[in-house]
């Protein structure tokens, strides 16, 4: 039975050209994470990080991604193009699945908040 | 052209220890991890553990953590991994391979590993 | 970890056939599938990535579909050398392979 839930940063903004955190977070479970996965708008692997053998971050975003902090993502040098929804799958055992969702969106205006509230999706 | 070129077979006895070198060439070497897996007869490929040559950082797989170790030379880009208290069920063909992102895209050819008293 | 089993386990083909190899995971692998060939003595080699994508130099003749539990590699027209054992590889949860299917000449 699946009794956890994905806390994430809900709908946040960042400014093009900066930097933004990607933050789910597992609670009220004590199943084992065994790898969480960060998929982009399309659905497109980001990054892993796997429990035993570490992140790993796929080649075209290498310069732009940064693990962490903990199971987060950063996301750096931000372009409109990253605008859009961010996916963290959270895989344990042996609860099974758990999916948090992201919207970003990315301002051009100077005065763009960041804001970094958690909210249950 | 990418290439991982692996040392030859190898026949030890049980409680020895083994190291298998991995000379990489056609790329930056310290531009993606490598890892090392193997195959025993009639088993599956299975991973033993990674390194980035980067910094030297290692990660193991839980079954191989206190017997396996991953080093590099960069200078030579070189990776070895020794594996100590052999015995016979680690008879096996052991590969390196570099990741690119999330898959292995180049292999080592292999190294025999015949453990038997 | 997600566990993969490929069917068949050997499977005899002539020349020119058609042929198609199964993989299926224990759980949801979502695409991120994975296929290699490996010849006797030889390193494995990369054919398909993320399910379909056909990695560069790979004759066309290869393909890989799937979705869900279920992915599967099809050769179009056997060629002598592609016999060889295929293994499926998956990335989702776990990084794992399938055991393997051992194509023989018929």
């Known amino acids: 039975m699946m009794t956890g839930t994905i806390e994430t940063t809900g709908n946040i903004s960042a400014k093009k050209g900066g930097s933004v955190i990607l933050q789910c977070h597992l609670s009220s479970t004590m199943a084992q994470v065994t790898q969480v996965n960060w998929e982009q708008h399309d659905h497109s692997l980001l990054a892993i990080r796997n429990a035993e053998l570490g992140w790993h971050i796929y080649p075209a975003f290498k310069d732009r991604v940064a693990p962490g902090p903990g199971l987060g993502l950063t996301l750096q040098s931000l372009t409109m193009n990253d605008t859009g929804e961010y996916f963290c799958t959270y895989h344990t055992y042996p609860d099974g699945t758990y999916r948090g969702r992201i919207f970003l969106e990315v301002l051009e205006s100077s005065v763009a908040e960041h804001s970094a509230r958690f909210q249950i999706p | 052209e990418v290439q991982l070129v692996q040392s030859g077979a190898e026949v030890k006895k049980p409680g020895a220890s083994v190291k298998v070198s991995c000379k990489a060439s056609?790329?930056?070497?310290?531009?993606?991890?490598i890892y090392w897996l193997r195959q025993a007869p009639g088993q599956r490929l299975e991973i033993i553990g990674r390194i980035d040559p980067k910094n030297g950082r290692t990660y193991f797989v839980d079954k191989f953590k206190n017997r396996a170790t991953l080093t590099t030379d960069t200078s030579a880009s070189t990776a070895y991994m020794e594996l100590s208290s052999l015995r016979s069920e680690d008879t096996a063909v052991y590969f390196c391979a570099r990741i690119d992102g999330f898959y292995f895209d180049f292999w080592g050819q292999g190294t025999l590993v015949t453990v038997s008293s | 970890d997600i566990q993969l089993t490929q069917s068949p386990s050997f499977l005899s083909a002539s020349v020119g056939d058609r042929v198609t190899i199964t993989c299926k995971g224990s759980q949801n692998v979502n695409k991120y599938l994975v296929w290699y060939q490996q010849k006797p003595g030889k390193a494995p080699k990369l054919l398909i990535y993320?399910?379909?994508n056909l990695q560069s130099g790979i004759p066309s003749r290869f393909s890989g579909s799937g979705s869900g539990t279920e992915y599967t590699l099809t050769i179009s027209s056997l060629q002598p050398e592609d016999f060889a054992t295929y293994y499926c590889?998956?990335?989702?949860?776990?990084?794992?392979f399938g055991q393997g299917t051992k194509v023989e000449i018929k």
């Open positions: 590889y998956q990335y989702n949860n776990g990084f794992t």
């Open positions: 993320s399910t379909d």
């Open positions: 056609g790329y930056t070497f310290t531009e993606h991890s």
